[in-house]
Amino acid sequence: QFPRECANIEALRRGVCCPDLLPSSGPGTDPCGSSSGRGRCVAVIADSRPHSRHYPHDGKDDREAWPLRFFNRTCQCNDNFSGHNCGTCRPGWRGAACNQKILTVRRNLLDLSPEEKSHFVRALDMAKRTTHPQFVIATRRLEDILGPDGNTPQFENISVYNYFVWTHYYSVKKTFLGTGQESFGDVDFSHEGPAFLTWHRYHLLQLERDMQEMLQEPSFSLPYWNFATGKNVCDVCTDDLMGSRSNFDSTLISPNSVFSQWRVVCESLEEYDTLGTLCNSTEGGPIRRNPAGNVGRPAVQRLPEPQDVTQCLEVRVFDTPPFYSNSTDSFRNTVEGYSAPTGKYDPAVRSLHNLAHLFLNGTGGQTHLSPNDPIFVLLHTFTDAVFDEWLRRYNADISTFPLENAPIGHNRQYNMVPFWPPVTNTEMFVTAPDNLGYAYEVQWPGQEFTVSE
């Protein structure tokens, strides 16, 4: 959402979020690290091209033309500098001048050593308990953001992991149309459109970098869960990893896992949609998970097959009109899981990414809640690995990622909601090892084992 330094009346009224880096001569003397040439405060560029007609409520949603409703000036960082105040490096770079390339490796969770597995689980738990050092979340829509008295900004601190959950919730929430009116639900800034892969890529990258900083460990990387096993069991659902099934309640996580202690955020959907409030940092009930337990829907009781990945990687076109969840012969819609693995759209099909979520049959299967189950991280790193392999095979051909007329939030140059600083879909449509500083150690069915660099 927004840097803590910008969650105040003055910044909101001015529409300027250009925090100081090293204000040695007092506040406002080093916006965006300008004194050391790292960046400068500039006008925000937001996509103004038309979106598809799915969304008929222009002017009603704070997420439109993100982030212009809140801020119209922000930091533009030079060279490889990055961050809300240009105080960090772009992904894949390090050093005082951000001029040295680095590469971290995302590996299969099951291939990690016992020590590495334990470190990952501990790190996730630490992220759940550690206040995010930079960002705060809005708990009210823009019209109520200054509170009942017009003088109290409605922002809250939130943990590193819950921030990851909140950003996902904010991207999928309904559009509030007013008290007494039903909120509009046919809107999603991160799913059912071309931005699905780029949005989730940045989402993971943000969490990974937040955890690297939290641990002071630049090599820290998020592992993946190869969910394309064709099995009816969750192989990462063991107590040393993501938690086994509780013996006392088959929809809960075993008390032997730290994740049984986790409590979810953003579960009060009815309240948000009727009162027009936003999810806040308050935690509620436990994670629910019942892998392969949806007996009323046999099609989601088994995970995708290995050959489903092979087939989807043969779909050469990134996306196809109408750039939605009914696109056919679209790689994006295929890996997202609304089309069959061959690429053919079938309204009855749930495959790949969608099937893995639905297989979990609980918190992880509900879009507004799903990141609350940390398996979400592993599921999406694997989805991102498939995306990166597609980018590698087809030379990151962005030509079919639409510049306009995609669902709102999904145009190529749209700033992904609600990430800060503003970042477009285009910036994530690149091969990760060369451009984003990470690679996957992965073996695709029928291929040699490689690090994807």
Epitope: T88, R94, A96, Q100, R129, T131, M214, Q216, P218
Partner: antibody
């Protein structure tokens, strides 16, 4: 002036526990990660772990997990290392040291004078 | 875990000479490396961080270099006060291990 002042030498029995302190001055410990390092007699340096005093987060080298425990008191700008289940192998000098909060800077830039712990 | 192999274990040189100490990491540590000097009975003292940046107040006869897995500390125009133990330490991945140390003796 940045200083890390460590507590005095300790002579402890095997199996006992000991709590070492490191009082800092010249900087706010909330802005730095505090690390601890061990040096056995005539041996090299061994990294034990770090604490982020701002939130109490800790990380340990797996070989010290369970025997070392780091805590901080931000009101007195002091960090502590508690060692339990001591054996003669734990006879060493223990150093506290700080790392710049900006994690891009790879260095422990200021060190305490060390505390000698003798297990006998 | 990243292992740091430091060499030589000890060396002896005369005032005015140049010596080089090396550290080899078991994996790429991307310049996340520091060098320290420790005199007998004293605390370690930071010399170099980020593999090649001299810490404040450190004489320019000390210099760090290297990349990837291979790093070195060069001391030119040796002075008597340069005697002591030298250690490298990486900060790439947890745990942040040290090299085994090099004992430098001035003849």
């Amino acid at each position: 002036e940045v200083q890390l002042q460590q507590s005095g030498a300790e002579l402890v029995r095997p199996g006992a526990l000991v709590k070492l302190s490191c009082k800092t001055s010249g900087f706010n410990i909330k802005d730095y990660f505090l690390h601890w390092v061990r040096q056995r007699p005539d041996q090299g340096l061994e990294w034990i772990g770090w604490i982020n005093p701002d939130n109490g987060n800790t990380v340990y080298d797996p070989k010290f997990q369970g025997t070392a425990s780091l805590t901080a008191d931000t009101s007195s700008n002091t960090v502590y290392l508690q060692l339990s289940g001591l054996t003669s192998e734990d006879t060493a000098v223990y150093f506290c040291t700080r790392r710049d909060y900006t994690y891009e800077k790879a260095a422990l830039d200021y060190w305490g004078q060390g505390t000698t712990v003798t297990v006998s | 875990d990243i292992q740091m192999s430091q060499s030589p274990a000890s060396l002896s040189a005369s005032v005015g000479e140049t010596v080089t100490i090396t550290c080899r990491a078991s994996g790429n540590i991307y310049n996340y490396l520091a060098w320290y000097q420790q005199k007998q009975g004293k605390s370690p003292h930071l010399l170099v961080y980020d593999a090649k940046t001299l810490a404040d107040g450190v004489p320019s006869r000390f210099s760090g270099s290297g990349s990837g897995t291979q790093y070195s500390l060069k001391i030119s125009s040796l002075q008597t006060e340069d005697s002591g133990n030298y250690y490298c330490q990486h900060f790439w991945s947890l745990p942040f291990t040290f090299g085994s140390g090099t004992k430098l003796e001035i003849k």
